[in-house]
């Protein structure tokens, strides 16, 4: 056979779908491989030929379209499964081809298992809803192209393995579930599960996501630093190891680009020349809120370190501030032999 | 005085894993920074790849995050670009840079990768 | 994301003239942007950062402006050597993003 275009196993689409549901799995050439769609190169007379290898083997066979019920069937660019069974996982190809053309590319499917409470090894979405904003809707995921929109089918919503009915303040709205005033107490799994006929069948869609309650814009702020501060004094002898925390409090922004960092004399410390590290930590809280930590820590300060000015920075999108530290060399405790006896007029 | 040297093969093919390592030189280990990679397609603009911080945390363009890894070897003084599954769209000039908070200050002189069967 | 928008794509100017380039942020970016300036074969090299701060070796006749999401580079007397592509990058948010970029030319 003549040289075909092999984009080998596109590893990047871990395709999941449930055992016993329908799937329909589009071929990925055109997605993201070719400049060009199903259309175009249908009427090119080109012609899209699939084939898969079971997990586990290595032999690449035809698919079977001439099952029972048409169980697995090919539309233009997509392929079904009505429903999938579990020995349906393994790695699929689609090939695009005509006598003086050839393309390819294989990706893994993999056909899991939901327990009755939809726990599984499916990899789950997460959606981000702000704390106390007012209403908002999350949307049953990946249900399109399923049944035509003459079809109308029934939607059931659950929250872990709750059906939610009565909930005081998560409402069930077809294919959207409202919530009122999100709470860190909706933090969790939701499942959506869209039945619907089709020739005289049933079938069912099994959709769950995260969510994750995060905090609200309405209440975000620029970053607070709490250390350093005009409370503490750093006070050190030369020789003595100075530490500087920089704590800095950031209010949860989505995608905000959140950066703390020192200069020491206007410098970033890599740019002087004075043995300086600096350790970072970093911890959040339930909504997402974070603190940074970084220690500034020169471990044997000199009279002219103490002299340098050590100013803390932080940037989140809501702002910038900073905060310098006040450091200053300890003055020695007098030596009473000397000092005070003179003190004392002694001779 | 910092300086990046990219490097890597020029050739990838098709649906194979691009790898390409940044040397850096002059590093200090005091800089809590970040390291990045960007693009240019020929003829193209810049496109933003990723960084990863000193700590190893890392942020991706989420156009790429499902095909990219960025890893950093502070004791190889080394930042790593890993780009699976690549298609004939990611053939461009590599660049590795250093972000210290206001922009990329430093950058590597680039390589070029060309994807070809 | 943010999308940075650069105008116009080709600018023609004189040496000696003064030259504007713009930037427009899709969303508020407050003044947490920098501008590149590249030439054919090079990396790019950064001017200006935070919107108006000089990078370190960077004329004077370069400066730069705005906050927000309007945002420009001025260069008051071009110079033979200022001819080249330049972009401009936010750094705000997570992606960073960088616009389509503008080429500066000889008229």
């Known amino acids: 056979s003549e040289r075909c275009d092999d984009w080998g196993l596109d590893t990047m689409r871990q395709i999941q779908v449930f055992e016993d549901e329908p799937a329909r799995i589009k071929c990925p050439l055109f997605e993201h491989f070719l400049k060009f769609n199903y259309s175009t190169a249908h009427s090119a007379g080109l012609t899209l030929i699939w084939y898969w290898t079971r997990q586990d083997r290595d032999l690449e066979e035809p698919i079977n379209f001439r099952l029972p019920e048409n169980r697995i069937s090919k539309e233009k660019d997509v392929l079904w499964f009505r429903p999938t069974l579990l020995n349906d996982t393994g790695n699929y190809t689609c090939m695009l081809r005509n006598t003086t053309y050839c393309s390819k590319v294989a990706f893994p499917l993999e056909v899991v298992q939901k327990d009755s409470c939809f726990n599984s090894p499916m990899k789950l979405p997460v959606h981000k809803l702000y704390i106390e904003y007012g209403i908002q809707r999350i949307t049953c995921p990946n249900v399109d192209g399923y049944f035509p929109s003459s079809v109308k089918p029934t939607i059931t919503w659950y929250m872990g393995c709750y059906k939610i009915q009565n909930f005081n303040n998560v409402i069930p709205e077809g294919m959207n579930l409202s919530f009122l005033i999100a709470l860190i107490s909706n933090n969790g799994n939701y499942t959506c599960v869209v039945t619907y006929p089709e020739n005289g069948r049933t079938f069912h869609l099994t959709r769950t996501l995260t969510v994750k309650v995060v905090g609200s814009p309405k209440n975000a702020v620029p970053p607070v630093i709490h250390s350093p501060n005009d409370h503490v004094v750093y006070e050190k002898e030369p020789g003595e190891e100075l530490l500087i925390p920089c704590t800095v409090y950031f209010s949860f922004l989505m995608d905000s680009r959140n950066e703390v960092w020192w200069t020491i004399d206007g410098k970033k410390p890599d740019d002087i020349t004075i043995d300086v590290t600096i350790n970072e930590s970093i911890s959040h809280s339930r909504t997402e809120d974070e603190t940074r930590t970084q220690i500034l820590s020169i471990k044997k300060v000199t009279s002219e370190d103490l002299k340098r000015s050590y100013v803390c920075h932080a940037r989140s999108a809501k702002g910038e501030v900073a905060k310098a530290a006040k450091v200053k060399q300890k003055v020695p405790a007098p030596r009473y032999t000397v000092e005070l006896a003179c003190g004392f007029g002694a001779t | 005085q910092v300086q990046l040297q990219e490097s890597g093969p020029g050739l990838v093919k098709p649906s194979e894993t691009l790898s390409l390592t940044c040397a850096v030189s002059?590093?200090?280990?005091?800089?809590?920074?970040?390291w990045a990679w960007i693009r240019q397609p020929p003829g193209k603009g810049l496109e933003w790849i990723g960084n990863?911080?000193?700590?190893?945390?890392?942020y991706y363009n989420p156009s790429l995050e499902s095909r990219v890894s960025i890893s950093l070897d502070t004791s190889k003084h080394q930042v790593s670009l890993k780009l699976k599954s690549v298609t004939y769209a990611d053939t461009a000039v590599y660049f590795c840079?250093?972000?210290?908070?206001?922009?990329?200050?430093?950058w590597g002189q680039g390589t070029m990768v060309t994807v070809s069967s | 994301e943010i999308v940075m928008t650069q105008s116009p794509a080709t600018l023609s100017v004189s040496p000696g003239e003064r030259a504007t380039l713009s930037c427009r942020a899709s969303?508020?970016?407050?003044?947490?942007l920098a501008w590149y300036q590249q030439k054919p074969g090079q990396a790019p090299r950064l001017l200006i950062y935070?919107?108006?701060t000089r990078a370190t070796g960077i004329p004077a006749r370069f400066s730069g402006s705005g906050s927000g999401t309007e945002f420009t580079l001025t260069i008051s007397s071009l110079q033979s050597e200022d001819f080249a592509v330049y972009y401009c990058?936010?750094?705000?948010?997570?992606?960073?993003?960088f616009g389509g970029g503008t080429k500066l030319e000889i008229k």
């Open positions: 840079a250093r972000d210290r908070f206001d922009g990329f200050d430093i």
């Open positions: 002059g590093y200090s280990a005091s800089g809590l920074y970040y």
């Open positions: 990863i911080y000193h700590s190893g945390r890392t």
């Open positions: 969303q508020t970016i407050n003044n947490i």
């Open positions: 935070g919107a108006s």
């Open positions: 990058q936010q750094y705000n948010n997570w992606p960073l993003t």
